[in-house]
Interface confidence: low
Amino acid sequence: MRTEAQVPALQPPEPGLEGAMGHRTLVLPWVLLTLCVTAGTPEVWVQVRMEATELSSFTIRCGFLGSGSISLVTVSWGGPNGAGGTTLAVLHPERGIRQWAPARQARWETQSSISLILEGSGASSPCANTTFCCKFASFPEGSWEACGSLPPSSDPGLSAPPTPAPILRADLAGILGVSGVLLFGCVYLLHLLRRHKHRPAPRLQPSRTSPQAPRARAWAPSQASQAALHVPYATINTSCRPATLDTAHPHGGPSWWASLPTHAAHRPQGPAAWASTPIPARGSFVSVENGLYAQAGERPPHTGPGLTLFPDPRGPRAMEGPLGVR
């Protein structure tokens, strides 16, 4: 379920309508408040790096910028979920990690970020224009995915450059626009709240947003200025894709699965030394996808010996659009 971010543009009212639309004073603060609240919508970042020492070796780092509990992370290549990707690794905070060649080492870096080292030869070798995708399933936000790849001109040993690419996809431009609108809106809302209720109506009003966008999503400006943006779902050189990709709907996961159904709704358990989420200074950040969980509060997996909770008879809820290969 792809929802393109729509920019709720703020436009001046038509001349002469100000008196007839005094109700804007009441409506606008709530609209802006809604926008401010959704400014906390989670995002996923992806950083792809080719190692200088081994030209066929890649490091993929992904992180989740959200407040929810991560229940599953799926890393795939060749495209996102349901779009031709094949799962490389699935990381479950309690159940552990699954990885498939050419993935060599997948691990949790922090409570909300992971890294994957990839190497291979022949048909299963990654190559510079391969797209890598990370999907985070979290509760209650749902599933969020981003994809990235090395820019064609990247030198070994370097990740994507810190400057934005000149051409943005429409949804990324929309995300960036939303960030600006939200920033403006939040400041403006504070301004409105300080005014007396009987002051004249504001001269700005939001236009109707597209019905396709149930909510606008923000993309952190700090990342926008640092991350390199690449057009996702780029055509992949088939010689660089796994041999299994001639399937009808290949990809990964968890499934696998670029997505895996899961019920987990818990705070990840892992190394005590997990640090706070790093925001990469450079990387490939691409489109975000969200599929909300159909039900809340579903059971976690095993938490220790002797404790097993059986699944809801309906089974684990699938991450929509989803593993995986989880």
Epitope: N81, R98, H251, G253, P254, P261, A264, G324
Partner: antibody, heavy 119, light 106 residues
Framework: EVQLQQSGPELVKPGSSVKISCEAS????????VDWVKQSHGKSLEWIGA????????SYNQKFEGKATLTVDKSSTTAYMELRSLTSEDSAVYYC????????????WGTGTTVTVSS | DIQMTQSPSSLSASLGGKVTITCKAS??????IAWYQHKPGKGPRLLIH???TLQPGIPSRFSGSGSGRDYSFSISNLEPEDIATYYC????????FGGGTKLEIK
């Protein structure tokens, strides 16, 4: 009742392909991955691969990459496995199984499909 | 890949008796082992998962234990319908089955 009903036995010639099916019933098809497992005569079980019915995502045991192709048809709640370039080594009983995602084991299995490769 | 060594490959026991099957993993599998009963012409039936957790509807005559690399599965008070081949499955790292144990009744 949760069931995985598999297609009937197949007798095929070396070098050809075969596509076997696994029809799921009694549960929400998209909520569980479907895995395939091979049992050669007199031998143990080997995991072949898995598919997520929700979006067709797949993963394979490296040993079976290029040999098996997994697909699904959500409308008929059926998973398929195509085996190509068949040899006598591929003669076996193939099972589909439902995979409990959070705990990674297989809780419900199909009845099995016998594939015999013979000239 | 994790290897699972299951023993014995076959055994014979008397009705009402008890049998024990063992599986040894090539590395620690963190108790992520399941046991299946397999009868000819049918699909395997899950009996136990996570070392010792019985599936709903499975009689308590079936039990499992173990940790680290060593695991065991027992059937007590053997009944005729227990005649089958039993497999262990490690699911800590991908999936690997044991070689199977064929149980016969004396």
């Amino acid at each position: 009742e949760v069931q995985l009903q598999q297609s009937g036995p197949e007798l095929v010639k070396p070098g050809s392909s075969v596509k076997i099916s696994c029809e799921a019933s009694g549960y929400t098809f998209a909520d569980y991955n479907v895995d395939w497992v091979k049992q050669s005569h007199g031998k143990s079980l080997e995991w072949i691969g898995a598919i997520n019915p929700n979006d067709g995502g797949t993963s394979y045991n490296q040993k079976f990459e290029g040999k098996a192709t997994l697909t699904v048809d959500k409308s008929s709640t059926t998973a398929y496995m195509e085996l190509r370039s068949l040899t006598s080594e591929d003669s076996a009983v193939y099972y589909c199984a439902r995979w409990v995602i959070n705990d990674w084991y297989f809780d419900v299995w199909g009845t099995g499909t016998t594939v015999t490769v013979s000239s | 890949d994790i290897q699972m060594t299951q023993s014995p490959s076959s055994l014979s026991a008397s009705l009402g008796g008890k049998v024990t099957i063992t599986c040894k993993a090539s590395q620690d599998i963190n108790k992520y082992i399941a046991w299946y009963q397999h009868k000819p012409g049918k699909g395997p039936r899950l009996l136990i998962h996570y070392t010792s957790t019985l599936q709903p509807g499975i009689p308590s005559r079936f039990s499992g234990s173990g940790s680290g690399r060593d695991y065991s599965f027992s059937i007590s008070n053997l009944e005729p319908e227990d005649i089958a081949t039993y497999y262990c499955l490690q699911y800590d790292n991908l999936w690997t089955f044991g070689g199977g144990t064929k149980l016969e009744i004396k």
